[in-house]
């Protein structure tokens, strides 16, 4: 049982545990999200991602969540149960990122570039919101990210 992001395989992470951690904080996060018109993980970011692209894209998205979203939100959260759930999500994201080794070969340039352009769409949408709103929205959209990632899980 493992994720297969194209040539990149990830062991030891179970989708159910990610969802359970997300649900533990979902109501809190999405209740605070007042901007319902905008979406960060829009269709163009995650739709029709090829297997080869998926390794690059999931790597950049999860790194962004770890370095920008979880890190900043962690400093703003005091509720122990919420922190525990964030930690579960973050630890699993770390485990995934640590196993992803996207190829840096020249012949993969166009695939890498395509994945990067998808990521830039997400980051641009994130930067258009003020920091607090962007963090809340990014956390509220973890379900969109998990739904997409789940497509690459193989038993």
């Amino acid at each position: 049982q493992e994720f297969h992001f194209g040539p990149c395989q990830v062991k030891g992470v179970v989708p159910q545990k990610l969802w359970e951690a997300f649900w533990a904080v979902k109501d809190t996060m999405q209740a605070q999200d007042n901007i319902t018109s905008a979406r960060l993980l829009q269709q163009e970011v995650l739709q029709n991602v090829s297997d080869a692209e998926s390794c690059y894209l999931v790597h950049t998205l999860l790194e962004f969540y770890l370095k920008t979203v979880f890190k900043n939100y962690h400093n703003r959260t005091v509720e122990v149960r919420t922190l525990k759930s964030f930690s579960t999500l973050a630890n699993n994201f770390v485990l995934i990122v640590s196993q992803l080794q996207p190829s840096q070969e020249n012949e993969m340039f166009s695939i890498r570039d395509s994945a990067h352009r998808r990521f830039l769409l997400f980051r641009r949408a994130f930067k258009q919101l003020d920091v607090e709103a962007a963090l809340t929205k990014a956390l509220g959209e973890v379900d969109i990210l998990l739904t997409w990632m789940q497509k690459f899980y193989k038993l």
Epitope: Q1, V14, P15, Q16, W19, E20, W23, A24, Q43, L46, Q47, N48, D143, I144, L146, T147, W148, Q150, K151, F152, Y153, K154, L155
Partner: antibody, heavy 119, light 108 residues
Framework: ELQLVESGGGSVQPGGSLRLSCAAS????????MYWVRQAPGKGLEWLSL????????FYADSVKGRFTISRDNAKNTLYLQMNSLKSEDTAVYYC????????????WGQGTQVTVSA | SYELTQSPSVSVAQRQTAKITCGGD??????AQWYQQKPGQAPVMVIY???RRPSGIPERFSGSNSGNTATLTISGAQAEDEADYYC???????????FGGGTHLTVL
């Protein structure tokens, strides 16, 4: 061999209650999400409820929210569905199902138990 | 609420290819599952995560999912494939498992 066996079905009057059970064997019950799905006579499949591994999260279809309650006893390897305020439109075959392991994928099903709600 | 739309019936000649479709708003971003149900029996999963086959399911069953349509393909349909087929996905905004209305496959 993996087995899911439903029981507790039967006939009941409108407004009445029933408790369905699903006895699981052949796998580590506590590691999997479980579901209840029903099928009215001549109709399609209708999802009713989902419960996570430890019962920490439960979800329901709008049609049964507030009337049905899903629960599990991991020590007894058993899934339950408490059905209250039953209506004639609840008449159906009720199936329990086990997640495949990838999430939201109903990989194994019981044979079902018939519930008839009629005056 | 999220809806999955299937045509009620599809016919295919034996040993020909059958395609059963499932329409849903941006279903390509979700994981699609397919179930086979024969009369008087419980459903059986034939495809999960868009295109993956559970063990024991014949290779003639395959799946794809893109845009607004998920497709179940049966290459070289056999008489025993005659059944009802249901697609299914998870609607994360409503926290609900959603089934399509079902398609009856007739193998001529």
């Amino acid at each position: 061999e993996l087995q899911l066996v439903e029981s507790g079905g039967g006939s009941v009057q409108p407004g009445g209650s029933l408790r369905l059970s699903c006895a699981a064997s052949g796998f580590t019950f506590s590691n999997y999400w479980m579901y209840w799905v029903r099928q009215a006579p001549g109709k399609g499949l209708e999802w009713l409820s989902l419960i996570t591994t430890d019962g920490g999260s439960t979800f329901y279809a709008d049609s049964v929210k507030g009337r049905f309650t899903i629960s599990r006893d991991n020590a007894k390897n058993t899934l339950y569905l408490q059905m209250n305020s039953l209506k004639s439109e609840d008449t159906a075959v009720y199936y329990c199902a086990k997640d495949l392991g990838s999430g939201f994928s109903l990989g194994s099903w019981g044979q079902g138990t018939q519930v008839t709600v009629s005056a | 609420s999220y809806e999955l739309t299937q045509s009620p019936s599809v016919s295919v000649a034996q040993r020909q290819t059958a395609k059963i479709t499932c329409g849903g708003d941006n279903i390509g971003s979700k994981s699609a599952q397919w179930y086979q149900q024969k009369p008087g029996q419980a459903p059986v999963m034939v495809i999960y995560s868009d295109s993956r086959r559970p063990s024991g399911i014949p290779e003639r069953f395959s799946g794809s999912n893109s845009g607004n349509t998920a497709t179940l393909t049966i290459s070289g349909a056999q008489a025993e494939d005659e059944a009802d087929y249901y697609c299914q996905a998870w609607d994360s905004s409503a926290n609900a498992v959603v089934f399509g209305g079902g398609t009856h496959l007739t193998v001529l």
